[in-house]
């Protein structure tokens, strides 16, 4: 098995992830593993020398960088919060704070905004990934209601009066729950006609 450094006339290396082509010497040299950087470049007689990233810096990939990247905190002013810390092998992982969605994306989220309210009678469609997009409000399905303007309220099933030993006084709608009453309670005068039928 050939180990770096080795000559390459076609400018390609055997292991693209862990090696790179050095055009000045026309050789393939080792990249440095994640969490390290190049402290001494390779030559025809000596392979790349790597050193560990200093505290508060990182390199995520096999690389031939001469520096490590600086760790950056999640910016709360931009609505971001940390979900995993920066280490020598990984940058800080951020996500939108609860109740927010990503409004600006440049390789990663850079700015979050408040989720829109869903009006009564609707709820936010459930997303695969929290914080990915703004709310898309969908109507409550039959037999359910939601009576507030909220970014997170869910439609609830209408109360079943009979389960509580009561009778229905007014049916539920998408925006209100069923109204129940005692079977012995008399109906208001305007409803007594319906009752007789």
């Amino acid at each position: 098995q050939v180990v770096p450094p080795y000559g390459s006339e076609n400018q390609t290396c055997r292991d693209q992830e862990k090696e790179y082509y050095e055009p000045r010497h026309r050789i393939c040299c080792s990249r440095c593993p994640p969490g390290t950087y190049v402290s001494a470049k390779c030559s025809r007689s000596r392979d790349t020398v790597c050193a560990t990233c200093a505290e508060n810096s990182y390199n995520e990939h096999w690389n031939y960088l001469t520096i490590c990247q600086l760790c950056r905190p999640c910016d709360p002013v931009m609505g971001l919060e940390e979900i995993a810390p920066c280490t020598s092998k990984r940058k800080t992982q951020c996500r939108c704070q609860p109740g927010m969605f990503c409004a600006a994306w440049a390789l990663e989220c850079t700015h979050c905004e408040l989720l829109s309210d869903c009006p009564p009678g609707t709820e936010a469609e459930l997303k695969d990934e929290v914080g990915k997009g703004n709310n898309h409000c969908v109507p409550c399905k039959a037999g359910h209601f939601q009576n507030t303007s909220s970014p997170s309220a869910r439609c609830q099933p209408h109360t079943r009066c009979e389960d509580q030993g009561l009778v229905e006084a007014a049916p539920g709608t998408a925006q209100s729950d069923t109204t129940c009453r005692n079977p012995s309670e008399s109906l208001p005068p305007e409803m007594s006609g319906t009752m007789l039928m």
Epitope: P34, G35, T52, E55, N56, E60, K89
Partner: antibody
């Protein structure tokens, strides 16, 4: 040869204190994070605490927060764990472990042989 | 905290046969930016400390025999010993280092049948 050697374990009464030490050799101690990991007899491994290479960042398992303190002396290549208000459930073999990282959140590539801590009256 | 669940608790395999150990994490440990799973496997023999076998779910630590291999992604992982040797009798642990605190599975004991 890369090596970690723990000391300071022993028998202590509930409510008592103990200070564990871990002497490191064979690597640039200040470049790497260190952790304490414990194993109660016949039980799972449990990460106890971690400290970054410089000593500027520390973290603790909820079970020991407020009772244990991790520290390091990079000039002496030594890691410490100060354990106060010890409880019976702290009884375990305590290992010091090196991370391949300045942050403790990584694979533990080198482990010490462990030191036994017994909390009993 | 991310909970790591290993199965089976113990495993008896004939010499030269394949041993398969499973590990499931309660949350995704795949970091999409570098496509790496922040999961390790350790081997612990009686009276000894754990020894790192595999990191990033599938990368063998130097000096580890190639009969040990790791696979899986996201939440489901496997450690395979392709041809069990007598010296492989041990307890095997998975551990996630995706988020603080790092957490371990409770181990799988591998014995010879």
């Amino acid at each position: 040869e890369v090596q970690l050697v723990e000391s300071g374990g022993g028998l202590v009464q509930p409510g008592g204190s103990l200070r564990l030490s871990c002497a490191a050799s064979g690597f640039t101690f200040s470049s790497y994070a260190m952790s304490w990991v414990r194993q109660a007899p016949g039980k799972c491994l449990e990460w106890v605490s971690g400290i970054s290479g410089s000593g500027g960042r520390t973290n603790y398992a909820d079970s020991v927060k407020g009772r244990f303190t991790i520290s390091r002396d990079n000039s002496k290549n030594t890691l410490y764990l100060q354990m106060n208000s010890l409880r019976a459930e702290d009884t375990a073999v305590y290992y010091c472990a090196k991370s391949d990282n300045w942050h403790y959140l990584d694979a533990f590539d080198i482990w010490g042989q462990g030191t036994m801590v017994t909390v009993s009256s | 905290d991310i909970v790591m669940t290993q199965s089976p608790d113990s495993l008896a395999v004939s010499l030269g046969e394949r041993a398969t150990i499973n590990c499931k994490s309660s949350q995704n440990v795949l970091y999409s930016s570098n496509n790496k799973n922040y999961l390790t496997w350790y081997q612990q023999k009686p009276g000894q400390p754990p020894k790192l076998l595999i990191y990033w779910a599938s990368t063998r630590e130097s000096g580890v025999p190639d009969r040990f291999s790791g696979s899986g992604s996201g939440t489901d992982f496997t450690l395979t010993i392709s041809s069990l040797q007598a010296e492989d009798v041990a307890v095997y642990y998975c551990q996630q280092y995706f988020n603080t605190p790092p957490t371990f599975g409770c181990g799988t004991k591998v014995e010879i049948k």
